[in-house]
């Protein structure tokens, strides 16, 4: 699902307030509901009909620094007999999300929002077959 554009209107101050020079603003990176956790079912990535592996990407200049990415293990999907079914495809499920990017310019540090694509898992689909006209 596409994230709505974070337009300038989102960050605009109320009309009664003076404008901030250079378009800068304060950003509190404390997290609301920080203790809220999404718990995955045990080994769901291995029990899925389109199993996947996880890779942790690390970037010290990104917040959060750690982003987990999934990669589909198979081209096809796993059937009830545990065999790869090549009439179907395992495809990644991707979600756009925003992270904060830290940028160094000499001694000054600035922060910018960056859109990243996170693969959260895989699903099984019927592939598209193109017929030559």
């Amino acid at each position: 699902r596409k994230i709505p554009k974070v337009g300038h209107t989102f960050f605009q101050k109320p009309e009664s307030c003076p404008p901030v020079p250079g378009g800068s603003m304060k950003l509190d990176i404390g997290i609301i509901n920080e203790n809220q956790r999404v718990s995955m079912s045990r080994n769901i990535e291995s029990r899925s009909t389109s199993p996947w592996n996880y890779t942790v990407t690390w970037d010290p200049n990104r917040y959060p620094s750690e982003v987990v990415q999934a990669q589909c293990r198979n081209l096809g999907c796993i059937n009830a007999q545990g065999k790869e079914d090549i009439s179907m495809n395992s495809v990644p499920i991707q979600q756009e999300t925003l992270v904060v990017r830290r940028k160094h310019q000499g001694c000054s540090v600035s922060f910018q929002l960056e859109k990243v694509l996170v693969t959260v898992g895989c699903t099984c689909v019927t592939p598209v077959i193109h017929h030559v006209q």
Epitope: K2, C72, L75
Partner: nanobody, 123 residues
Framework: EVQLVESGGGLVQPGGSLRLSCAAS????????VGWIRQAPGKQRELVAT???????NYADSAKGRFTISRDNAKNTVYLQMSSLKPEDTAVYYC?????????????????WGQGTQVTVSS
């Protein structure tokens, strides 16, 4: 969407070689996992070889030691080098790829099949 076009098939004598190509085209896409699948007349489709986006390969027992799958990411093309061909390798060879596509709706992933290329091994 992504179009896959296979080429390189033909008639070859037993013991001969062929190199199949699978070229992917489209607007804004990245090819992930790709496989070569074959179907002989009156038989079920068989997975011959696969290659991941990172270059890891996997082969069916019937292809091990004789076939080599490779990819050229810059050309969005995957190859299947077939050597020591046998009459039982006669089949239509299809390319199947999973690709991530970006269009006006956003980014999504899907599976795509080509039309296939005929390989006939006969003396």
């Amino acid at each position: 969407e992504v179009q896959l076009v296979e080429s390189g098939g033909g008639l070859v004598q037993p013991g001969g070689s062929l190199r199949l190509s699978c070229a992917a085209s489209g607007r804004d896409f990245r090819v992930k996992n790709v496989g070569w699948i074959r179907q002989a007349p009156g038989k079920q489709r068989e997975l011959v070889a696969t290659i991941t986006v990172g270059g890891s390969t996997n082969y069916a027992d019937s292809a091990k030691g004789r076939f080599t799958i490779s990819r050229d990411n810059a050309k969005n093309t995957v190859y299947l080098q077939m050597s020591s061909l046998k009459p039982e390798d006669t089949a239509v060879y299809y390319c199947n790829a999973v690709a991530t596509v970006t269009d006006y709706t956003g980014t999504y992933s899907d599976g795509f099949w080509g039309q296939g290329t005929q390989v006939t091994v006969s003396s």
